[in-house]
């Protein structure tokens, strides 16, 4: 959670002299309450906007907008405190609008905006606008709060921001997974334009369960430059387990900008549909009997196998 370094934020507008100051999130009116305090903000709105830094990097920002209520309390309005709380880390950042002149009229509705809080992909924030001075301890609250959920890097506009690109958002592996004979999966995906290794993580599940019945990890060495953007094909051997039929294939890249924390892509193969009507009993005897007591779950000594090649 940080403030955009460029351009300098502005809160002055026609009819109001104002400056933006950093704030400790603890306005003096908390400690020294005033008798007369303004009413709360009206129509607080938070939207996702995007802004460039001086270095040319693109970041998501919270665009905060609110209006004043059309009452006489604007005569006592000395400014506003804007506070952004990141829910998962409890980090809070505040700025203060300090009014250097008095608001005297409501010829038009007063509207304020601020777009300098840089936010992170896939994070949740509580945005609060407090009118200043803050109310006496038992006074009516004069703040408004709203939650703001920032989309993750799958979002079209987010994809091209610097934090998302750093985590590999521009790579689209276009994964395809097909089931082959003899308990095998063929995984195909497009390599990125970086000489870095990949990992394929295969997790298999029974039809309606979330506890895995088979896991396998396959390492793909770094491609050569002539293999960039080519398809890589990998054949994974599955465990021959009855009912262990839903397969999740996850591809983890290790790009230099994100190392072991890059965005992963996955594809899932569902279990084959069960026929609605029972199958007719065959008029021949099977060549084997199902082994009684056989386990549908993985044994540590029974590993899957795989092989791969890059396709040009």
């Amino acid at each position: 959670l940080r403030l955009l370094d460029f351009p300098a934020p502005v809160c002055a507008q026609e009819g109001l002299s104002c400056r933006v100051k950093n704030s400790t999130c603890l306005d003096d009116s908390w400690i020294h309450p005033r008798n007369l305090t303004p009413s709360s903000p009206k129509d607080l709105q938070i939207q996702l906007h995007f802004a460039h830094t001086q270095q040319g990097d693109l970041f998501p920002v919270a665009h905060i907008e609110w209006t004043l209520q059309t009452d006489a309390s604007i005569l006592y309005l000395e400014g506003a405190e804007l506070s952004v709380l990141q829910l998962n880390t409890n980090e809070r950042l505040c700025v203060r609008f300090e009014f250097l002149s008095k608001l005297r009229h409501h010829h038009r509705r007063w509207r304020f905006t601020f777009s300098h809080f840089v936010v992170d992909p896939d994070q949740e924030y509580e945005v609060t606008v407090h009118h200043l001075p803050k109310p006496i301890p038992d006074g009516d609250p004069n703040h408004q709060s709203k939650n703001f959920l920032v989309p993750d890097c799958e979002h079209a506009r987010m994809k091209v921001t610097t934090p998302c690109m750093s985590s590999g958002s521009l790579w689209d592996p276009n994964i395809t997974v097909e089931t082959l004979e003899a308990h095998q999966l063929r995984v195909s995906f497009t390599l990125w334009n970086e000489s870095t290794h990949y990992q394929i993580l295969l997790t298999s599940f029974p039809h309606m369960e979330n506890h895995s019945c088979f896991e396998h990890m396959h390492h793909i060495p770094a491609p050569r430059p002539e293999e960039f953007h080519q398809r890589s094909n990998v054949t994974l051997t599955l465990r021959n387990l009855k009912g262990c039929c839903r397969h999740q294939v996850q591809i983890q890249p290790f790009f230099s900008s994100c190392l072991n924390d890059c965005l992963r892509h996955s594809a899932t193969v569902s279990c084959p549909e069960m026929p609605d009507t029972p199958e007719p009993i065959p008029d021949y005897m099977p060549l084997w009997e199902p082994r009684s007591g056989s386990s549908d779950y993985k044994d540590d000594d029974d590993k899957g196998s795989s092989h791969h090649h890059h396709h040009h």
Epitope: L87, N88, D261
Partner: antibody
Framework: EVQLVESGGGSVQPGGSLRLSCAAS????????MNWVRQAPGKGLEWVSI????????HYADSVKGRFTISRDNAKNSLYLQMNSLRDEDTAVYYC???????????WGQGTTVTVSS | DIQMTQSPSSLSASVGDRVTITCRAS??????LAWYQQKPGKFPELLIY???TLQSGVPSRFSGSGSGTDFTLTISSLQPEDVATYYC?????????FGPGTKVDIK
């Protein structure tokens, strides 16, 4: 001294209700999100719910969604958990916990015990 | 929802041993991971946050590492007072799920 003190636990029949409270002191309560975490006898920790500092963000674990309601009163430095339609599996020690700036929960109450049994 | 797993579920080690506990997230959670120690009959205590930052007051024999999906808590030299259950917790986004715990005792 930073302190959280839970109260309101007790025994209740399945389908019944209880309201837990957590009294905070020694810090600016209104600046922090707050959590409830529970622990069934002999089991691990289970995160239950979070409420942001101004109550505009609330989340629940799937296991309690629709039955539990988290709330707070910043003027009273208090956090609450209203528990309805209680089930046997809600039997646990319930802790309120304050998040640390940067992540994790660094201040915990001593816990209050809820027993759901017929 | 993201699942958290821990291994081993329990371990016994001698005083002075190096102990390693691993925590795995089913999807990447960046470094949004905390470790807690809970002694029998007590409330949990925060040991590590942001995957590798030691909470103030926690002995330096505790350390954390990892990012993305795989995380490790290491006790460099196990002490008798370290007998406890250790939990990881992810906090990238709600729900802030805990791992199932690893019980550590002395041989």
């Amino acid at each position: 001294e930073v302190q959280l003190v839970e109260s309101g636990g007790g025994s209740v029949q399945p389908g019944g209700s209880l309201r837990l409270s957590c009294a905070a002191s020694g810090f600016t309560f209104s600046s922090y999100s707050m959590n409830w975490v529970r622990q069934a006898p002999g089991k691990g920790l289970e995160w239950v719910s979070i409420i942001s500092s101004r109550s505009s963000i609330i989340h629940y674990a799937d296991s309690v969604k629709g039955r539990f309601t988290i709330s707070r009163d910043n003027a009273k430095n208090s956090l609450y958990l209203q528990m309805n339609s209680l089930r046997d599996e809600d039997t646990a020690v319930y802790y309120c916990a304050r998040p640390k700036v940067g992540g994790g929960m660094d201040v915990w109450g001593q816990g209050t015990t809820v027993t759901v049994s017929s | 929802d993201i699942q958290m797993t821990q291994s081993p579920s329990s371990l016994s080690a001698s005083v002075g041993d190096r102990v390693t506990i691993t925590c795995r997230a089913s999807q990447g959670i960046s470094n949004y991971l905390a470790w807690y120690q809970q002694k029998p009959g007590k409330f949990p205590e925060l040991l590590i946050y942001a995957a590798s930052t030691l909470q103030s007051g926690v002995p330096s024999r505790f350390s954390g590492s990892g990012s993305g999906t795989d995380f490790t808590l290491t006790i460099s030299s196990l002490q008798p007072e370290d007998v406890a259950t250790y939990y990881c917790q992810k906090y990238n986004r709600a729900p802030f799920t805990f791992g199932p715990g690893t019980k550590v005792d002395i041989k």
